[in-house]
């Protein structure tokens, strides 16, 4: 499977040549270039950057580089009518207003077109009412409020802290609880690491910093007005009332200084336990409403943002494969940012740029990959993964027949502690083998492999001597490729120490303070972590595009399927009586997993032994590997989520960022004890077990000998 066996290349054009061409200094230079002004989706600045990247990729040597444009629904604040939140007194006078913008960082005071903090796709509205503090606004937080504390959020404005789950899930939960508005804020407990200074003196969030972000619940739909189909020139668009995933209540984000002014006045119930308290000097009372002296005061939201159909631009670069040009390995990451994008996305875009440059250098020397490599700079990721999803919708027939793998390339860093990888089990062995060949950039691991430092710092919870690799969830551009189309996918970045830093994401995420200086001064001054991520992402693409036999190991899928089956069975077994009453059995699923395991084992044996010089047999075996991920797709999709079609993995219904295994069964079992019709609920559990068992069995059969 060595890359230098690939056709039409001299021995020096191997993986080593590709990796040696990657330079930290270039990544640094590209990052600087991409972060000097905002590149908000739908703006002229982001169009200009798309054209610059197109031009540079052509110079780097790609065969073709095209812009693919779509007209999608985006959301912007009203420039003359700013969004804010007030405390009003009994006469309706505004006695306190939240900030209209973040104090700009040093050196950026005169930059124009910094979009003020807002929740993208919030409807307009000016609701007023009593405040209820709902912790992280997770499903379990609303259970605690409504079931245990008997607090009714109906007609209230809720205030929730960012973190733990995707903000869109928070808004959905608040809507279902009957709230008439949502205030989101960053609590220092989640966005301020102890012992670190606030920006610009450190990488912590200052009190005036605010996290922007979309609050959609698209469930993989892409453009809210054209679900399932590309938002092209002749698209039929839904009316706004029928648009997918839009929130129905006003939502607005604030920083912790403004949040303190709201939270310090809260009365009503005390927090149920310490997990509801953040780090501000406020009581974290739940409410509803303000305490004694302030009980006549209310909170009022003023939201005037507008939804507008706007043109976006993907950049699609092609490096044609020499042997299998009809097999595509895709490296994609987004280009649009909320403001400067110092980390998200440009730390990723700079890495992609350097990977393209390295591949281009090899191509100019006469080399070509075995398979075609597609490079993508996606637009409007921040507005709901729109650019990648529209392109995949437009090209779905090609992708489902030709797509070998998708490697995602958003932020290269969210910390500088160790590697973090989320991928399909098919890529586990690829990632392990690659990281064993790469040098660790970590202090104290000089001369050691990346695999070694990664395993030491982030050990697998199941397998001794191996690193943790996580399930793919969503919240990034791999979603359509993996969850909808069933193309093997993976992502890698450098991360923080999750054990010592319990804040969510990185503190300056989606704020104006996410600048080039943040990265250069505090996260990666030598750009050695960026270089390592470039080597991992680039190395994966190189191997996937160049290995004679695809570097997928189907036995690793067998292992995780058994683990997931055990997990979902143990969840179901929390209800032994009902399982008996309704004759719920997991036998079919365990049997299918057993069959999959045996067939995968036999396939792997054949893979070692077959004649690799026979192009027909080689292509046949590779196609079985390529189409295995596809075999886990159910064309009907998951219940109420038609664009999440992968039966083994889906984004959690309670947190888009997290992956859930056997999601159909999981959701059917969730909170089943509270269902009004237990017979119907357990019937759905049985149906989901049936779908999962069938799908695993059907996938196994794609690995059987063809005749």
């Amino acid at each position: 499977k060595s890359s230098n066996e690939a056709t039409n290349i001299t021995p020096k054009h191997n993986m080593k040549a590709f990796l040696d061409e990657l330079k930290a200094e270039n990544i640094k230079k590209f990052l600087y270039n991409f972060t000097q002004i905002p590149h908000l989706a739908g703006t002229e600045q982001n169009f200009q950057l798309a054209k610059q990247i197109q031009s540079q990729w052509k110079e780097f040597g790609l065969d073709s580089v095209e812009l693919a444009h779509y007209d999608v629904l985006l959301s912007y604040p009203n420039k003359t009518h700013p969004n804010y939140i007030s405390i009003i007194n009994e006469d309706g006078n505004e006695i306190f207003n939240t900030s209209l913008f973040e104090p700009p960082p040093p050196g950026y005071e005169n930059v124009s077109d910094i979009v003020p903090p807002f929740s993208a796709f919030s409807p307009q509205g000016m609701p007023e009412g009593d405040l209820v503090y709902v912790n992280y606004a997770r499903t379990e937080d609303f259970f605690k409020l409504e079931r245990d504390m008997k607090i009714n959020c109906s007609g209230k404005i809720v205030i929730a802290r960012y973190g733990k789950v995707f903000r869109g899930n928070k808004v959905k939960n608040a809507q279902l609880a009957g709230a008439k508005g949502v205030i989101l804020y960053s609590d220092p407990a989640d966005y301020f690491a102890p012992g670190v200074k606030s920006y610009p003196d450190g990488w912590n969030l200052p009190g005036g910093g605010v996290q922007r972000g979309n609050i959609l619940n698209l469930n993989g739909a892409g453009d809210p007005l054209t679900p399932g189909y590309p938002a092209n020139e002749y698209a039929y668009r839904r009316g706004i009332a029928e648009a997918v995933g839009l929130p129905s209540i006003p939502v607005h984000p604030i920083g912790y200084y403004d949040a303190q002014k709201l939270l310090e006045k809260m009365g009503g119930s005390a927090p149920p336990d310490s997990s509801w308290r953040g780090s501000l000097k406020v009581p974290y009372n739940v409410g509803p409403g303000f305490t004694g002296n302030f009980s006549t005061q209310k909170v009022k939201m003023h939201i005037h943002s507008t939804n507008e159909v706007t043109r976006i631009y993907n950049v699609i670069g092609t490096l044609r494969g020499a042997v299998e040009p009809d097999r595509y390995v895709i490296l994609g990451g987004h280009r649009d940012s909320w403001v400067f994008g110092g980390i998200d996305p440009q730390s990723g875009a700079a890495v992609v740029h350097e990977i393209v440059r390295s591949f281009g250098t090899l191509k100019k020397e006469g080399w070509r990959p075995r398979r075609t490599i597609l490079f993508a700079s996606w637009d409007a990721e921040e507005f709901g993964l729109l650019g990648s999803t529209e392109w995949a919708e437009e090209n779905s027939r090609l992708l489902q027949e030709r797509g070998v793998a998708y490697i995602n390339a958003d932020s290269s860093i969210e910390g500088n502690y160790t590697l973090r990888v989320d991928c399909t089990p098919l890529m586990y062995s690829l990632v392990h083998n690659l990281t064993k060949e790469l040098k660790s950039p970590d202090e104290g691991f000089e001369g050691k492999s990346l695999y070694e430092s990664w395993t030491k710092k982030s050990p697998s919870p199941e397998f001794s001597g191996m690193p943790r690799i996580s399930k793919l969830g969503s919240g990034n551009d791999f979603e359509v490729f993996f969850q909808r189309l069933g193309i093997a996918s993976g992502r890698a970045r450098y991360t923080k120490n999750w054990e010592t830093n319990k804040f969510s994401g990185y503190p300056l995420y989606h704020s104006v303070y996410e600048t080039y200086e943040l990265v250069e001064k505090f996260y990666d001054p030598m750009f050695k972590y960026h270089l390592t991520v470039a080597q991992v992402r680039g190395g994966m693409v190189f191997e996937l595009a160049n290995s004679i036999v695809l570097p997928f190991d189907c036995r690793d899928y067998a292992v995780v399927l058994r683990k997931y089956a055990d997990k979902i069975y143990s969840i179901s077994m929390k209800h032994p009586q009902e399982m008996k009453t309704y004759s719920v059995s997991f036998d079919s699923l365990f049997s299918a997993v057993k069959n999959f395991t045996e067939i995968a084992s036999k396939f792997s044996e054949r893979l070692q032994d077959f004649d690799k010089s026979n192009p027909i047999v080689l292509r046949m075996m590779n196609d079985q590997l390529m189409f295995l991920e596809r075999a886990f797709i159910d064309p009907l999709g998951l219940p109420d989520r038609p664009f999440y079609r992968h039966v083994i993995y889906a984004p959690s219904s309670h947190n888009k960022y997290a992956g859930e295994s056997f999601p159909g069964i999981y959701d059917a079992l969730f909170d089943i004890e509270s269902k009004v019709d237990p017979s119907k609920a357990w019937g759905e559990v049985k149906r989901q077990i049936y779908v999962a068992a069938f799908t695993v069995q059907a996938a196994a059969e794609t690995l059987s000998e063809v005749a």
């Epitope: 009190g207 200084y257 000097k281 009581p283």
Partner: antibody, heavy 119, light 111 residues
Framework: VQLQQPGAALVRPGASVRLSCKAS????????MNWVMQRPGQGLEWIGM????????RLSQKFRDKATLTVDKSSSTVYMQLNSPTSDDSAVYYC?????????????WGQGTSVTVSS | DVVLTQAPLSLPVSLGDQASISCRSS???????????LHWYLQKPGQSPELLIY???NRFSGVPDRFSGSGSGTDFTLKIHRVEAEDLGVYFC????????FGGGTKLEIK
Amino acid sequence: VQLQQPGAALVRPGASVRLSCKASGYSFTYYWMNWVMQRPGQGLEWIGMIHPSDSETRLSQKFRDKATLTVDKSSSTVYMQLNSPTSDDSAVYYCARDGNFPYYALDYWGQGTSVTVSS
Amino acid sequence: DVVLTQAPLSLPVSLGDQASISCRSSQSLEYSNGNTYLHWYLQKPGQSPELLIYTVSNRFSGVPDRFSGSGSGTDFTLKIHRVEAEDLGVYFCSQSTHVPTFGGGTKLEIK
């Protein structure tokens, strides 16, 4: 961060006096401004604080009738009026910013205004 | 109001010695969020007070690491390892968990 206070003020007993504290170098509306009194050779005594964003005021019980705090956002200035001063009010009066999270302590102090109440 | 009692009132030291100042509170200073808002200030002769330590043990920016704070609940200590001439002045403890109050002060002076 700078907090500018006049060096001294001479006041007649009973004639109220307004002390000023002009802030610069930070986002004025985010931070409580405190007033602290120090009589000659004595310790520090907290008078009260005001939040520039909404003029919310919190006063020590002892100074409820003695001090009135106000703010002018346009000039980033906080004022403290001493009502019906007596010789007992002769002291240095400091304005000091409450550092908010993570400090919740008085992180920056003015130079103090020395008030002398004398006929 | 919370009463903060500092000891000693006066602390004569030789340069290079360690100094230790105690601050005792009339009630617990732990806030409901688990933090304790007990701070230490130094007022050098003829100057305004300056923040040294916040929330019991955190040095404010620019404060040398010879200053350290410790304690919990109602008992707190400020230690100065190897006193230097510029450390002389009056040290005040203060709390902001409840309505803010200050201790009476401890004068650090040369023996």
